[in-house]
Interface confidence: medium
């Protein structure tokens, strides 16, 4: 299907490629010392981006800093020096630059003030960095602004006293709406959600904070919950840990109503070392990680019902070192219900693993055509590809990139890997999928950093190295054949590659530094490929690709989750341009039910290797501890329940008698006198 | 090793409603897999019935669903066949037989050694 | 509902010589779900193969099973006296109704 990668041969050579290239680099060279530079794109498809350099130098009392502003309208090919835009000031970098949701145009920047000030001070711009305002702000802000999802001009933020501050206004007037709070989160339709200490502090009243809710940028407050350890926000869910009454457990509960009412997800309550993590949600479902108790380093990934309130086991021993550590897991945007994420063995190797359908079934990544398998494996013909992501980079092995996958650059997945039993710590190569994880092939010998431009049309990619480099090598065939470009004589460090997030540019810049004796200055190349793709795909470029296929004969073929999708995707022999407004062509078909289109509800269970839900033996006959929405309740169930999200129809439909499980509600999270509504006088 | 017998009536009138049941040994029913029936009209090929698991859920063949219920009784570990309204048709040797736990995996692993059922007046 | 066609209805042939049986789906059957049976006279069927390739616990290797799409056959490499029955294929997917074929008797020449 795909042969392993040529560079520079023969293979797909392009006619002129240097000229064209040549005539499309840009260099900018920046005239500062600064010691780190951070860029942020404003906006989507306008070509602006916002470079901040900063210098520090810190002396005995105080640290001396200084900050330049660059600003790019062309995407990065020439920059502005607009320092004198935010007067010089000094801005800090832990805040960074905070560029509002969607198109607005919005972007804050935090600057540094003196120690004696009233509160921080800030600058704001609504029209792409064209122009600042100065705000002196009535706090110190703890934690970077946060806009509204809804709305770009409200904003909230915590202060260094612990007070929660709303504007309304785009940061021009603030309002300190509540005191002594812990954590504070958007929700949907501008409602905030926020955690309060009653007595002492987050931290010592961790396990007895209360989850309050405005709904009117804190003009009233409603107490949704008490006793909560944290919460968290995913798709349609919001989540609260809550504190067990008996002992110094805590359970998750869940709610699809903005907190009006709760029920008790049936989840492993966790002790005081371990912690549940929201991996991934949507508005279907959610996956969500149970830590082990110990220090194991590993704990399960459940996957829910549409409720968020009934999990299924969906992979045991995952890796999750601790709380906020690192997991590999890992949404592949390119291919709908794909994930890739590590496990930890009895023998501490670690192992990647990947699932096609939502968490459903996990299984080894399919070993390279072509590969051989290293040290790492027992038998040297029957190995897996194992992929190298967060906890690789946090080891500090030599992996310069997570994976890497694009929505619009369909069934593509670049990522570094070796091919053994288990995750190697020699030097990785790069692989590439086209099919979203099916297959593999080596892209590149050796680590490198890569993007995706035009939509999958082209791949980047810059060798990882210690020494100084110059070039830059593409390819327009999803990765098998590679063409080296020298961008500049003079080789730099490089520091990063920055691409218009969405990979629809057809821009890249290279970023580093070049250094003599006692300076260093900063410089980028922006490399323009359109000129490589100088045509407009038309229709006979594209070709027809069933996602999922695995087995033409089966009538389910490329089904998952109830349907299956047909691409229309650019054939690899074509060098010519998706386009900025490319819109990815696909044809969904809805797919008959079979079993495998159920999870098993509350009270049942899929025993390994088969089809049917079956009632847990320790439940039969027995009361249920299942609480839903805070209330005793009868749950009839006939043990089956639609996976979320799929959209099969017809075929087997899994009626049986519908049992009623008689249960006690043994959550008193809610107790109904805890929750006032309350007014802010 | 798991053992099937049938066992049941091998004379039934037309219009009758045909009851076999299929006694499982070795193996307990509620452990799992699909268990089904399977007839074969003399001197003629394999027809299947329908399957059940020991929860329940059953799967009839469309062309006799109208007629046929399977049930299974775990607690004397055995599962059971009615064919309604039965006719000259409907004479042949009545297998039962046990599949493995999934579907898609239909096939059929254990037999028993049938019993030959006709329908006359 | 998917219709099996086995030929040849009959298939005359010696101890020792090479069977190849075929079985023709009406639509696409995935490999993964034909299963080949054998039956001797007054004799429940027994399983030789599913997954169209892979035999059942205690089948000798001469039995094989290969395949695809609407087109599988069941080889035996050297028929032994044993063999001379009837061979049924199914196909066992994960929709009912769950079909067999018409059947195919192996004689002795």
């Known amino acids: 299907r795909r042969g392993a990668p040529a560079e520079d041969q023969d293979c797909g050579r392009l006619p002129d490629f240097i000229a064209k290239l040549t005539n499309n680099t840009h260099q900018h060279v920046f005239d500062d010392l600064s010691g780190s530079v951070s860029l942020s794109w404003v906006g989507d498809s306008t070509g602006v981006i916002l470079v901040l350099t900063t210098f520090q130098v810190p002396l005995v009392i105080v640290s001396f800093g200084q900050s330049k502003l660059y600003r790019s309208e062309d995407y990065g090919k020439n920059f502005k020096d607009i320092t004198n835009l935010i007067n010089n000031t000094f801005i800090r970098t832990e805040f960074g630059m905070a560029i509002g949701p969607e198109n607005s145009g919005k972007v804050i920047l935090t600057a540094e003030v003196s120690g004696g000030s009233r509160g921080g001070r800030v600058f704001r711009s609504s029209d792409f960095a064209k122009n600042f305002v100065q705000t002196d702000l009535p706090f110190h802000p703890l934690t970077q602004m946060m806009y509204s999802p809804q709305n770009s001009d409200y904003l909230l933020a915590l202060s260094t006293e612990n007070g929660l501050w709303v504007s309304k206004n785009f940061g021009e007037k603030w309002e300190e709406i509540h005191k002594a709070v812990c954590l504070a989160k958007w929700g949907p339709n501008n409602i905030i959600f926020f955690t309060t200490h009653v007595n002492g502090s987050c931290k010592a009243d961790l396990g007895a904070l209360e989850l309050w809710r405005t709904s009117d940028l804190g003009k009233t407050f409603k107490t949704i919950g008490v006793k909560i350890y944290s919460f968290g926000l995913g798709g349609r869910f919001l989540f609260a840990s809550v504190m067990a009454d008996k002992d110094t457990t805590r359970r998750i509960h869940v709610s699809t109503d903005q907190g009006d009412t709760w029920s008790m997800a049936q989840l492993p309550s966790v002790g005081q070392e371990q912690f549940y993590s929201i991996l991934a949600a949507n508005e279907d479902m959610v996956f969500m990680h149970v830590d082990e108790p110990g220090d194991t380093g590993f704990g399960t990934i459940f996957t829910s019902d549409d409720r968020g309130i009934v999990y299924s086991k969906s992979l045991d021993r995952h890796l999750y070192t601790t709380t906020g550590g690192e997991t590999d897991f890992t949404n592949v945007t390119s291919l709908r219900g794909v994930y890739i994420t590590s496990t930890l063995s009895e023998d501490n190797s670690i192992q990647s693993m990947i699932t096609f359908d939502q968490g459903g079934r996990w299984e080894h990544l399919r070993k390279p055509e072509n590969s051989k398998c290293d040290a790492t494996a027992k038998n040297k013909n029957e190995c897996s590809l194992h992929i190298h992501a967060s906890y690789s980079i946090s080891q500090k092995l030599n992996v310069p990139m997570a994976p890497l996958s694009e929505p619009n650059a369909v069934g593509i997945v670049i990522a570094h890997g070796s091919v053994g039993d288990a995750i190697s710590v020699m030097v990785p190569d790069v692989y590439i999928s086209d099919d979203g994880g099916y297959s593999w092939a080596k892209m590149l010998e050796g680590p490198h950093y890569y993007t995706i431009l035009d939509s999958g049309g082209i791949i980047v990619a810059i060798e990882h190295s210690n020494r100084p480099i110059n070039v830059i090598k593409f390819s327009t065939d999803e990765g098998q054949c590679w063409q080296s470009y020298v961008f500049t004589q003079e080789p730099i460090y490089f520091t990063g590659l920055a691409s218009e997030p969405g990979a629809r540019s057809m821009n890249i810049s290279i970023w580093g530094f070049t250094e003599s004796f006692i300076t260093r200055q900063w410089v980028s190349y922006t490399v323009d490929f359109k000129d490589i793709l100088e045509r407009n795909c038309e229709e006979d470029d594209y070709t027809t690709w069933l996602a999922h296929s695995t087995d033409p004969g089966d009538y389910k073929d490329g089904c998952i989750l109830g349907y299956k999708e047909q691409f229309l995707r650019l054939r690899k022999s074509s060098v010519c341009q998706n386009g900025r407004d490319y819109v990815v062509a696909k044809q969904p078909s809805v797919c008959p039910c079979s079993l495998e289109d159920f999870l098993c509800d509350f009270g049942y269970f899929r025993p390994e290797n088969a089809s049917e839900c079956v009632e847990q033996p320790e439940l039969k006959g027995h009361e249920l501890e299942f609480c839903l929405y805070g209330k005793e309740e009868h749950l009839t169930t006939n043990g089956y329940r639609k996976i979320p999200g799929d959209k099969c129809q017809g075929g087997m439909n899994p009626a049986r008698e519908v049992k009623d499980l008689k249960k006690k509600c043994t959550s008193n999270f809610l107790n109904p006198t805890k929750q006032n509504s309350k007014s802010n006088s | 090793q798991v053992q099937l017998q049938e066992s049941g009536p091998g004379l039934v009138k037309p219009s009758e409603t045909l009851s076999l049941t299929c006694a499982v040994s070795?193996?307990?029913?509620?452990?799992?897999?699909?268990w089904g029936w399977i007839r074969q009209p003399p001197g003629k090929g394999l027809e299947w019935i329908g399957s059940?698991?020991?929860?329940?859920?059953?799967y009839y063949n469309p062309s006799l669903k109208s007629r046929v219920t399977i049930s299974v009784d775990t607690s004397k570990n055995q599962f059971s066949l009615k064919l309604s309204s039965v006719t000259a048709a409907d004479t042949a040797v009545y297998y039962c037989?046990?599949?493995?736990?999934?579907?898609?995996?239909?096939?059929?692993?254990?037999w028993g050694q049938g019993t030959l059922v006709t329908v006359s007046s | 509902e998917i219709v099996l066609t086995q030929s040849p209805g009959t298939l005359s042939l010696s101890p020792g010589e090479r069977a190849t049986l075929s079985c023709r789906a009406s639509?696409?059957?995935?490999?993964?779900?034909l299963a080949w049976y054998q039956q001797k006279p007054g004799q429940a069927p027994r399983l030789l193969i599913y997954?169209?390739?892979s035999r059942a616990t205690g089948i000798p290797d001469r039995f094989s099973g290969s395949g695809s799409g609407t087109d599988f056959t069941l080889t035996i490499s050297r028929l032994e006296p044993e063999d001379f029955a009837v061979y049924y294929c199914?196909?066992?997917?994960?929709?009912?109704?769950?079909?067999f074929g018409g059947g195919t008797k192996v004689e002795i020449k």
């Open positions: 059940i698991y020991h929860s329940g859920n059953t």
């Open positions: 997954g169209a390739s």
């Open positions: 070795g193996y307990s029913i509620s452990s799992g897999y699909y």
């Open positions: 639509q696409s059957v995935s490999s993964s779900y």
């Open positions: 199914q196909q066992h997917g994960r929709l009912p109704p769950w079909t």
């Open positions: 037989a046990r599949g493995p736990p999934e579907l898609g995996k239909m096939y059929f692993q254990h």
